[in-house]
């Protein structure tokens, strides 16, 4: 069994080496900056990311094109729940910077955990998403 | 050295059938998603379908949707299209490509190209 | 599906000069999946550029790539004799990941 665990998490690493989370990330702040510009935020302020969503794209043009690739990346982990969860732990920990306050954090957490049930995938049943800087309980 | 060698091309009837597969080599096939890329004589590039990594996701073009079906052997580094009905229509080069992204910022794109196959249909 | 618009059909240049060509899209496509690829005569197609600006590895930095939402452009600085061949624009966030017609860029 030990063996077993270890030849899954290789594998799972491998995957996750090869997934472009990216199309998720985008897909998420999509979202949650659309909700944002829905209450009044400045949709014209500046961006680190090349990719991130223009103006234009917030208000939904270009986003499913961010979630079709998104789910396909997310597809990949389907039979692998441990191995989901791992590419959302992921995609939480390259975004957490970018996130401004803990109300912006929350709701990126609360989209990104319906985001298999959104690609029509089985969501992970326990997976803990809070970004520490120390260990983490991975199931 | 990357490359992809497709084979299986040729002269085929209306209504006929054609397997189409591409050799990859140099790389390790199972970490790239796949494409097949048509081109008719004279004509611009055309998409016809994509298989990621693991196959679970799947398109194609509409113009062959039902007739065609892509699939792929991790195991033996190799890339198919299976050609059904095929029509005047399909008369092309097909290119078999590889699809890689940008790790750090995102973007997919077709890195790597074969030299093409042709298929031509004709009574 | 996403339809996209390349204009011109065909481009007469002379080497030296400034190419502009036009990809525009039928909707907004995310610069993510904006790709442009050159082709010859007789040889597979070659990618250019990626992510809508981003130069693949060994391309020239006269070839940049510009645009965002519905219209994109790629722009040649100063045209090489070997830059005449035909470019194609591609949006591959959408299935069918659809292609343009195609610019013919030719020598004047």
């Known amino acids: 069994r030990q063996q077993w665990e270890l030849q899954g998490d290789r594998r799972c690493q491998s995957q996750l080496e090869r997934a472009n989370l990216r199309p998720c990330e985008q897909h998420l702040m999509q979202k949650i900056q659309r909700d944002e510009d829905s209450y009044g935020r400045d949709p014209y302020s500046p961006s680190q990311d090349p990719y991130s969503p223009s103006p234009y794209d917030r208000r939904g043009a270009g986003s499913s094109q961010h979630q079709e690739r998104c789910c396909n990346e997310l597809n990949e982990f389907e039979n692998n729940q441990r191995c989901m969860c791992e590419a959302l732990q992921q995609i939480m920990e390259n975004q957490s910077d970018r996130l401004q306050g803990r109300q912006q954090e929350q709701q990126f957490k609360r989209e990104l955990r319906n985001l298999p049930q959104q690609c029509g995938l089985r969501a992970p049943q326990r997976c803990d998403l809070e970004v520490e800087s120390g260990g983490r309980d991975r199931y | 050295e990357v490359q992809l060698v497709e084979s299986g091309g040729g002269l085929v009837q209306p209504g006929g059938s054609l397997r189409l597969s591409c050799a990859a080599s140099?790389?390790?096939?199972?970490?790239?998603?796949m494409n097949w890329v048509r081109q008719a004589p004279g004509k611009g590039l055309e998409w016809v379908s994509s298989?990621?990594?693991?196959?679970?996701?799947?398109y194609y073009a509409d113009s062959v949707k039902g007739r065609f079906t892509i699939s792929r052997d991790n195991a033996k580094n190799s890339l198919y299209l299976q050609m059904n009905s095929l029509r005047d229509e399909d008369t092309a080069v097909y290119y078999c490509?590889?699809?890689?992204?940008?790790?750090?910022?995102?973007?997919?794109?077709?890195?790597?190209w074969g030299k093409g196959t042709t298929v031509t249909v004709s009574s | 599906e996403i339809v996209l618009t390349q204009s011109p059909g065909t481009l007469s240049l002379s080497p030296g000069e400034r190419a502009t060509l036009s990809c525009r899209a039928s909707?907004?496509?995310?610069?993510?999946?904006l790709v442009w690829y050159q082709q010859k005569p007789g040889q597979a197609p070659r990618l250019l550029i990626y992510?809508?600006?981003t130069r693949a590895t060994g391309i020239p930095d006269r070839f940049s790539g510009s645009g965002s939402g519905t219209d994109f452009t790629l722009t040649i600085s100063r045209l090489e004799p070997e830059d005449f061949a035909v470019y194609y624009c591609?949006?591959?966030?959408?299935?069918?990941?659809?292609f343009g017609q195609g610019t013919k860029l030719e020598i004047k």
């Open positions: 140099g790389f390790i096939f199972s970490d790239y998603n």
């Open positions: 490509a590889r699809e890689d992204f940008d790790v750090s910022t995102g973007p997919y794109y077709m890195d790597v």
């Open positions: 591609q949006q591959n966030g959408n299935s069918p990941y659809t």
């Open positions: 298989i990621t990594r693991s196959s679970r996701t799947i």
């Open positions: 909707q907004s496509v995310s610069n993510m999946f």
């Open positions: 992510g809508a600006s």
